[in-house]
Interface confidence: low
């Protein structure tokens, strides 16, 4: 089994590892499927691409019957199977079978924390946000290891790329020193950013 690892939105080339001449195409059936779901078929030279892969999949007949998947999504991850059948003696017989495992990485970048003052009060608001990761993130604010209550945490998913964005607001009293950590957990991974507030200089120091 061949393993291919790519970042989300990148291009993946999955090779069948087999060549068929133009002359043989009329007597050949080629199937690409992913975990028993069809991706692409070519029968007697006629190609059919399934809706989930339309407009983002290229069949490269000249390059080992490879499929090229553009703009990778997290759901593209899985095991792909290429089957080549050839017509011999009144029946199609299997000539070749190959498996390719595709891993799609979608890591959230380190979150950014922006801050602004709420007029006529001692309250300051910080917003932690990051986007472009998978699976669904869970954001928490911590101070001295204690979890804090955010005002509003928004998790959204792009229907095209399947990637998530997350942002969260936290209000704090600017008359005391603070060190807040914005922690984002997704799957078995995590990213974080720290925001420090110093009352003496009335300025903040993001931990970069």
């Amino acid at each position: 089994v061949i393993h291919v690892t790519k970042e989300v939105k990148e291009v993946a080339t999955l090779s069948c590892g087999h060549n068929v001449s133009v002359e043989e195409l009329a007597q050949t059936r080629i199937y690409w499927q992913k975990e028993k779901k069809m991706v692409l078929t070519m029968m007697s030279g006629d190609m059919n691409i399934w809706p989930e892969y339309k407009n983002r999949t290229i069949f490269d007949i000249t390059n080992n019957l490879s499929i090229v998947i553009l703009a990778l999504r997290p759901s593209d991850e899985g095991t792909y199977e290429c089957v080549v059948l050839k017509y011999e003696k009144d029946a199609f017989k299997r000539e070749h079978l190959a498996e390719v495992t595709l891993s799609v990485k979608a890591d959230f970048p380190t979150p950014s924390i922006s801050d602004f003052e709420i007029p006529t009060s001692n309250i300051r608001r910080i917003i932690c946000s990051t986007s472009g990761g998978f699976p669904e993130p869970h954001l928490s604010w911590l101070e001295n290891g204690e979890e804090l209550n955010a005002i509003n945490t928004t998790v959204s998913q792009d229907p095209e790329t399947e990637l998530y964005a997350v942002s969260s607001k936290l209000d704090f009293n600017m008359t005391t020193n603070h060190s807040f950590m914005c922690l984002i957990k997704y799957g078995h991974l995590r990213v974080n950013q720290t925001f420090n507030w110093n009352t003496t200089k009335q300025e903040h120091f993001p931990d970069n």
Epitope: S129, S131, E136, N152, T154, V155, S156, Q157, D158, P159, E160, Y164, A165, S167
Partner: antibody, heavy 127, light 108 residues
Framework: QVKLQQWGEGLLQPSETLSRTCVVS?????????WTWIRQTPGRGLEWIGH????????NYNPSLKSRVTISKDTSKNQFFLNLNSVTDADTAVYYC???????????????????WGPGDLVTVSS | AYELTQPPSVSVSPGQTARITCGGD??????VHWYQQKPARAPILVIY???DRPSGIPERFSGSKSGNTATLTINGVEAGDEADYYC???????????FGGGTRVTVL
Amino acid sequence: QVKLQQWGEGLLQPSETLSRTCVVSGGSISGYYYWTWIRQTPGRGLEWIGHIYGNGATTNYNPSLKSRVTISKDTSKNQFFLNLNSVTDADTAVYYCARGPRPDCTTICYGGWVDVWGPGDLVTVSS
Amino acid sequence: AYELTQPPSVSVSPGQTARITCGGDNSRNEYVHWYQQKPARAPILVIYDDSDRPSGIPERFSGSKSGNTATLTINGVEAGDEADYYCQVWDRASDHPVFGGGTRVTVL
């Protein structure tokens, strides 16, 4: 073609709980959609109450109603629900269930609209 | 909170052009959507993403945007166009729709 049908109690007394059901036909409740509740009063116009995401359990509520509102769904029955407790006469309105494609979310969301609406029904809160 | 401002009413003669405006502080960066609502009926989406028209909506309805003001234009107004019209944007910070106050179009 997706259609929404809705029902629930039409007359409530103050402090009671408003409950509404919306049935989705002609399509699945799962998918990249926000299933939404909106209400309309002559004074306040169209007011978004909240929504639930078709592909998960994510909900979002109008901050002014958040403490009183719950939106849920039953995927197996292709239905979603609104519960609004401790109603007052200010909750008298026409209530609509609706569907909106999930907005395009890159860094933050933009672009969402409401493409399918239920017929709406009047809920009156009166003692 | 995000606010959208519409004129309360617009009057127009049959066959003329009706223009309804919708203004918001940051509308230039948001897609604006428009709904038509006739008495005792649910709203209908007539324009989405500033200027796109859903299938089944007559070509007489069009949308445009200049700066922070979006405009719904109804060419060759008919008696059946008499209705309330609402603009809407998506409040990106709070992840929910925000509606304008509505404009009543009266066909004289």
